[in-house]
Interface confidence: medium
């Protein structure tokens, strides 16, 4: 009983339950392969609890091991389109600080119009994650087709 | 020591660890695109801890942010079959209550025979999730090829 | 206040936060379809907190429901290569103890060069997970293209 009461009084943040799910806002100008994300209840089902957005890129606020997941669907796409515009590749990585820059997850579209994957990775407070889409095709901004999120799993 | 004892005495349900992993039972009649699911240890490795099945659809019992994941493999399928029968699309959404109806996750098969994805989304007690497979191809019932699950992540 | 102190004193392991993320080490000899994994901070972003590696295969140390995820990318691959070498299939399963041998997750590459999926499954202490890649194509060893991991979710 004492435990249950104490648990309710503890702010969720102290349990380390940082989590975010983002929807696509826009792509960058021609020479910038990054996807720019947005999140918040006013936009629908996206949210940020802990992490923050910095110019459309996701910044981590708590050290730990995170589950990072992403799905990107190319807009108005058929397998013919996808193969004609090959290679179209998506990479998720730490883009700042520069000293920690690394690619975490990479997928090519080949003859498909959607990629989806997830992985566990250690992230540190201040790490900014970038999602780079290279190629000439544009992603769909439908919120059930393109999304990106992280979930804190353990210290 | 006191803490560990208290923790063991607390029912898991009070920690909000709702989780379910389902296997395909059957598809619906001709005009019903929904997949019908089943779960329970007697069936193999599927289970429901918290959520419930309502006529083969998954009903949520606890408010919170959930990780929803799915894999569907088409039966008797090759890339030729898949492209010939295109578009075959899978959508996971809240189908009831009607006031909360929305598509959460959508993928097309294009020239592939399997789709797999996952996302974080807020769900509320009473939300029923439906998985709609549109197109003429049928899903495999092999439990390692087609499955659907949810995991409560945080309030 | 008492609760927070107690929580900090508890070793993480007692909370059941077993987690592992592995990178590909090598493939097996000709008649062995298994992928051999490696993990640890010296290798980069891979790690084992709880589970262990036994001759390149992942052994579970704590009973519970786990989220198992994998991504495998074929090396030197195009959609033409993938379809010409079809069927190339990846299966994740319990390979020992033999009494619990079962396939948990299975995907074919068809015309794609990457597969990625995840699922919830009950695992028991001592279960060893094997990942079998059948076909003539080889997997990429790039750590952002091929990885395998598990995360303890609940008892």
């Amino acid at each position: 009983q004492r435990f249950a009461q104490a648990q309710q009084q503890l702010p969720l943040e102290s349990l380390g339950w940082d989590v975010a799910e983002l929807q696509l806002n826009h792509t960058g100008p021609q020479q910038d392969p990054r996807l720019y994300w947005q999140g918040g209840p006013a936009l629908g089902r996206s949210f940020l609890h802990g992490p923050e957005l910095d110019k459309g890129q996701l910044r981590i606020h708590r050290d730990g091991i995170y589950m990072v997941h992403i799905q990107v669907t190319l807009a108005i796409c058929s397998s013919t389109t996808a193969s004609r515009h090959h290679p179209t590749t998506l990479a998720v990585g730490i883009c700042s600080p520069a000293s920690r820059s690394i690619s975490l997850l990479r997928l090519s579209f080949h003859q498909g119009c959607t990629i989806a994957s997830q992985r566990l990775t250690p992230l540190a407070r201040g790490d900014t994650l970038c999602t780079n889409l290279t190629g000439t095709l544009l992603p769909s901004r439908n919120t059930d087709e393109t999304f990106f999120g992280v979930q804190w799993v353990r210290p | 020591q006191r803490f560990a004892q208290a923790q063991q005495q607390l029912p898991l349900e009070s920690l909000g660890w709702d989780v379910a992993e389902l296997q395909l039972n059957h598809t619906g009649p001709q005009q019903d695109p929904r997949l019908y699911w089943q779960g329970g240890p007697a069936l193999g490795r599927s289970f429901l801890h918290g959520p419930e099945l309502d006529k083969g659809q998954l009903r949520i019992h606890r408010d919170g942010i959930y990780m929803v994941h799915i894999q569907v493999t088409l039966a008797i399928c090759s890339s030729t079959t898949a492209s010939r029968h295109h578009p075959t699309t899978l959508a996971v959404g809240i189908c009831s209550p009607a006031s909360r109806s929305i598509s959460l996750l959508r993928l097309s098969f294009h020239q592939g025979c399997t789709i797999a994805s996952q996302r974080l989304t807020p769900l509320a007690r009473g939300d029923t999730l439906c998985t709609n497979l549109t197109g003429t191809l049928l899903p495999s019932r092999n439990t390692d090829e087609t499955f659907f699950g949810v995991q409560w992540v945080r309030p | 206040q008492r609760f927070a102190q107690a929580q900090q004193q508890l070793p993480l392991e007692s909370l059941g936060w077993d987690v592992a993320e592995l990178q590909l080490n090598h493939t097996g000899p000709q008649q062995d379809p298994r992928l051999y994994w490696q993990g640890g901070p010296a290798l980069g972003r891979s790690f084992l907190h709880g589970p262990e590696l036994d001759k390149g295969q992942l052994r579970i140390h704590r009973d519970g429901i786990y989220m198992v995820h994998i991504q495998v990318t074929l090396a030197i691959c195009s959609s033409t290569t993938a379809s010409r070498h079809h069927p190339t299939t990846l299966a994740v399963g319990i390979c020992s103890p033999a009494s619990r041998s079962i396939s948990l997750l299975r995907l074919s590459f068809h015309q794609g060069c990457t597969i990625a999926s995840q699922r919830l499954t009950p695992l028991a202490r001592g279960d060893t997970l094997c990942t079998n890649l059948t076909g003539t194509l080889l997997p990429s060893r790039n750590t952002d293209e091929t990885f395998f991991g598990v995360q303890w979710v609940r008892p």
Epitope: L24, H26, T27, P29, Q30, L35, P41, A42, L43, G44, R45, A75, I76, L138, P139, S140, R141, N142, T143, D144, E145, T146 | A91, G93, S101, I102, S103, R106, N132 | -
Partner: antibody, heavy 122, light 110 residues
């Protein structure tokens, strides 16, 4: 087959109100951004408003801002345009249009209804 | 704000080739304007023809093609057919989520 059927048009006096509706079928309505586009008699196309798939974000052309309100009901597969303080220059054929969902808020209108006529005159 | 410009009218002989242009009163059209072309035959709703410069929508014949040449977006019809007689609208993406249509080009197939 995608179908968009508009209704609610008619003759109204300047300063009056009208409510246009669009019934959608043949696709998963709740996943698409939806738009209203109008065409004055003998003139070109003018984008009026759009709404995101969940109804949380809306945009309006400057010419209608503050007077028109776009909304949607995903449970009923309907899109509506509430038009207040109507002016003679709002006279047009109003099309309900589906946005293909391209990123960058680049509207690509891949399915159109047949339109409903609105006439604002005294 | 820039205005999207199109030729008011053009004509082409059956089997001939015609080029419709789409420009801006100030500045050049670039790929960042994501040019889109729509066709509206008399008494019908518009239909999507070409999007993001040069991608043909499903069901659109291969005689229709899009490009950017110089400072304008171009719609080329190679081997025009009588059924191509219609109004053609170009739309360009401008800043602040604005999507501007041109005034349209009436194409006559003589």
């Amino acid at each position: 087959e995608v179908q968009l059927v508009e209704s609610g048009g008619g003759l109204v006096q300047p300063g009056g109100s009208l409510r246009l509706s669009c019934a959608a079928s043949g696709f998963t309505f709740s996943v698409y951004y939806m738009n209203w586009v109008r065409q004055a008699p003998g003139k070109g196309l003018e984008w009026v408003s759009d709404i995101n798939n969940e109804g949380g974000t809306t945009y309006y052309a400057d010419s209608v801002k503050g007077r028109f309100t776009i909304s949607r009901d995903n449970a009923k597969n309907t899109l509506t345009l509430q038009m207040n303080s109507l002016k003679p220059e709002d006279t047009a054929l109003y099309y309900c249009v589906r946005d293909a969902g391209y990123s960058n808020h680049v509207p690509i209108f891949d399915s159109w209804g047949q339109g409903t006529q609105v006439i604002v005159a005294s | 704000q820039a205005v999207v410009t199109q030729e008011p009218s053009l004509s082409v002989s059956p089997g001939g080739t015609v080029t419709l242009t789409c420009g801006l009163t100030s500045g050049s059209v670039t790929s960042d304007n994501f040019p889109v072309w729509y066709q509206q035959t008399p008494g019908q709703a518009p239909r999507l023809l070409i999007y993001t410069i040069n991608s043909r929508h499903s069901g659109v014949p291969s005689r229709f093609s899009g490009s950017i040449t110089g400072n304008k977006a171009i719609l080329t019809i190679t081997g025009a057919q009588p059924e191509d007689e219609a109004d053609y609208y170009c739309a360009l993406y401008l800043e602040n989520f604005a999507n501007e249509f041109g005034g349209g080009t009436r194409l006559t197939v003589l």
